[in-house]
Amino acid sequence: AGVFELQIHSFGPGPGPGAPRSPCSARLPCRLFFRVCLKPGLSEEAAESPCALGAALSARGPVYTEQPGAPAPDLPLPDGLLQVPFRDAWPGTFSFIIETWREELGDQIGGPAWSLLARVAGRRRLAAGGPWARDIQRAGAWELRFSYRARCEPPAVGTACTRLCRPRSAPSRCGPGLRPCAPLEDECEAPLVCRAGCSPEHGFCEQPGECRCLEGWTGPLCTVPVSTSSCLSPRGPSSATTGCLVPGPGPCDGNPCANGGSCSETPRSFECTCPRGFYGLRCEVSGVTCADGPCFNGGLCVGGADPDSAYICHCPPGFQGSNCEKRVDRCSLQPCRNGGLCLDLGHALRCRCRAGFAGPRCEHDLDDCAGRACANGGTCVEGGGAHRCSCALGFGGRDCRERADPCAARPCAHGGRCYAHFSGLVCACAPGYMGARCEFPVHPDGASALPAAPPGLRPGDPQRYL
C-alpha cells in the first residue's frame, strides 16, 4: 500500500511569443482545479476506461481576475498535493491523465460552470520510494509543470511497496538474515515468507504464506500469464494440460472494497459496487455531496445536500457505475467496418470513418477527395459526387474555416444550459431531465418517479456535474 503524490508547480502560457488570453476576466472571475487519473502503465485500456490505480481532484485554487490588457500570467494554483492512495503493489510503470479545469464564478444561474482548459497524458516508469520526478507538458497554448512520486505507507517498503518492515525486537541489530529497513534504520525487514513456489517476478505477499499476483498474471503461484483463451473455469486460463486454471485465489478474496462495498470479478480484475456516499475504485472516497458534482456524463444527482447524507447518481442510457463514469461498451462488437473508429454516444452508436470510407458503419468505399482541402484539421468526405468537410472540434463551415460555437445550435433539450467543453459541449440539465443532451425525462410514463427537485436544490436550479 502507498500513496502517489502529485505537486502542480505552474500552469501558464507555453514558451514562445504567442501568449494565450487569460481564461478569467473581470466580468468572469474564475479559479483552477486539477484532476489526475492513474492507470497501470501497460494495460490496454481505452482513454475513457476507469482510473484503475485511482483518481484525485484538487481543491479549488484562489479566485483570479484578469488585469485588463495584461498577458496571461502563471495562474494561481490550489494549495497542497494531489494524493492518490493505492492499496496493492505499486506497478512501476503507470499512465496518467492530468486535467486542468476552470471554474467560472460569474453570475451563473444555479452556481458555477466548469470547462476543461488543458489535458495532458503520458506513461512513466517510477519506483516507489524514489525522489520527486519533474514533468513539463505543453497542451495547446498552455504549459503545465508538475512533479510526482510514489511512496509506501508503513509497514510497506521497497520499489513496489511489497516488502514489510517491523520494529526491532532487539535494540542493537536485526535478526539473522534480516536487513535494516532503509530509510527506517530503527526497523527491520520482516521475515516475510510467501507461499512456497510463489513467482518472485510476478507474485508478492503482504502476509506470510500468501501469493498475490501483479497485473497480467494469475494462478495460485502467479506463474500463468492472463490471456483471453477460452476456459471453462471462471478464473481464466492456466495449466499446461487443459490451458485452464484450477480455481485459486480470486481478485475478490478478502473483499478489497471498503466501506461496505460489494465486490464482483471482472475478466481482468474486480469491480466494487459502492454504497451511497462512497465512490472510487475501492469505495474509499467519501464525504461527497451533489454540490461537488459527482455524477459524470449527464447523470442526475439526487440527495447529498451535506456530507453526512449520501447521494445517488441516476445515469442516462449508455452509462453506468455509481458515478455514471463507466460507458456501456457496445463498441466491443466492432460494428464499424474498414477500420472505422466506433463511438458509443450513449443514445446511439456512431462510426467515425477513415478517409475514403463513409456510411453509418463505414461500409461505403469512396474516391479520394482529390485536391480538396479542409482547413483546421478537418477531414474531407466524398459522397454522391460532392465533397464535404468533417470539421475538427471548434470549427465549422464548408471548408472548416469558421470558428464554430458548439452551443450555437442549442443542443440541450428541455431548457438545459450548454457549456463549451473539451469533448465538444456539456449540457447542464434542468430539474426532471437527464442525459448527454437532457433528452430523457427522469420518470417517463410513470416509471420509478424521482422527486421533482432533489433535496438541497431549488426548483429551477440546473443540475451540475463535472
Epitope: 482513454a47 506513461r123 512513466r124 513539463i136 495547446g140 484539421g377
Partner: antibody, heavy 117, light 107 residues
C-alpha cells in the same frame, strides 16, 4: 533569443570516448529538460535520453544505456553527453534539444561524430 | 517501445497542391504526437505538437489531426520552401520514438 550552441565535429578512433557539449542561452537553463537525439547518415532520428537540469534526473533509451552518459553544468548553462567504447555504429550527427516531456522546441546545430581507425 | 510507422517514405507535389503525411502508432498515444521539418543540412524544427497545436511562427498551411493510433499532417498549399524531410514523433512514453521520415520534393 533561445540558442543551443554545440561543440564542433569530432573524429575518434574505435574504443575511444568523446564528450559533446551544448551551451544554452536566451532562457533559464534549469527551466527545461535537455534531450539528445542521434541521426545516422541523414536517415531517421533516435532519442538517446534527456536530463532535467533542475533535479539532475535522467531518462535513457535502453538502447543507449551504458553507451551515453548525460550531465549538466548549471553554472555555465551547458549540457554534456559522453559516448564511450566508440564503434563505427556511433558515427552520426548528434543533436541537443530543449524541451519538456512532450516536445522539443529548440535544437542545436548538431555535432558530427566520425569513428574511424 | 512504441513503434511509429510513417507513410509515404517519399513524394513529389506541385506548388499549390495539398499534401498529406500519415503516421501510425503501435498503441494509443493520446494525442502526444509532434511533427518536425528537417531541411537539407539543418536541424529539425518543431511544426506541430499535441497532434494538432501549431508551433509559433509556423505557417497556417500546416495542420495536424488524428487521435488514438492514427495521425496525419496536411500542407494545404505546397510551397517550394516546404521541400524537406518530415518526421513524426510520439512523446507519450519514454523513449520518444520517431517515424521513418517522409521526403517531400517539388514536382
Amino acid at each position: 533569443e533561445v540558442q543551443l550552441q554545440q561543440s564542433g565535429p569530432e573524429l575518434e578512433k574505435p574504443g575511444a570516448s568523446v564528450r559533446i557539449s551544448c551551451k544554452a542561452s536566451g532562457y533559464s537553463f534549469t527551466d527545461y529538460n535537455m534531450h539528445w537525439v542521434k541521426q545516422s547518415n541523414g536517415k531517421s532520428l533516435e532519442w538517446i535520453g534527456n536530463i532535467d537540469p533542475y533535479y539532475g534526473g535522467t531518462n535513457y533509451n535502453q538502447k543507449f544505456e551504458g553507451k551515453a552518459t548525460l550531465t549538466v553544468d548549471k553554472s555555465s548553462s551547458t549540457a554534456y553527453m559522453q559516448l564511450k567504447s566508440l564503434t563505427s555504429e556511433d558515427s552520426a550527427v548528434y543533436y541537443c534539444a530543449r524541451g519538456g516531456n512532450n516536445y522539443g522546441d529548440y535544437w542545436g546545430q548538431g555535432t558530427t561524430l566520425t569513428v574511424s581507425s | 517501445d512504441i513503434q511509429m510507422t510513417q507513410s509515404p517514405a517519399s513524394l513529389a507535389a506541385s506548388v499549390g497542391e495539398t499534401v498529406t503525411i500519415t503516421c501510425r502508432a503501435s498503441e494509443n498515444i493520446y494525442y502526444s504526437l509532434a511533427w518536425y521539418q528537417q531541411k537539407q543540412g539543418k536541424s529539425p524544427q518543431l511544426l506541430i505538437f499535441n497532434a494538432n497545436s501549431l508551433e509559433d511562427g509556423v505557417p497556417s498551411r500546416f495542420s495536424g489531426s488524428g487521435s488514438g493510433t492514427q495521425y496525419s499532417m496536411k500542407i494545404n498549399s505546397m510551397q517550394p520552401e516546404d521541400t524537406a524531410t518530415y518526421f513524426c514523433k510520439q512523446a507519450y512514453d519514454v523513449p520518444w520514438t520517431f517515424g521513418g521520415g517522409t521526403k517531400l520534393e517539388i514536382k
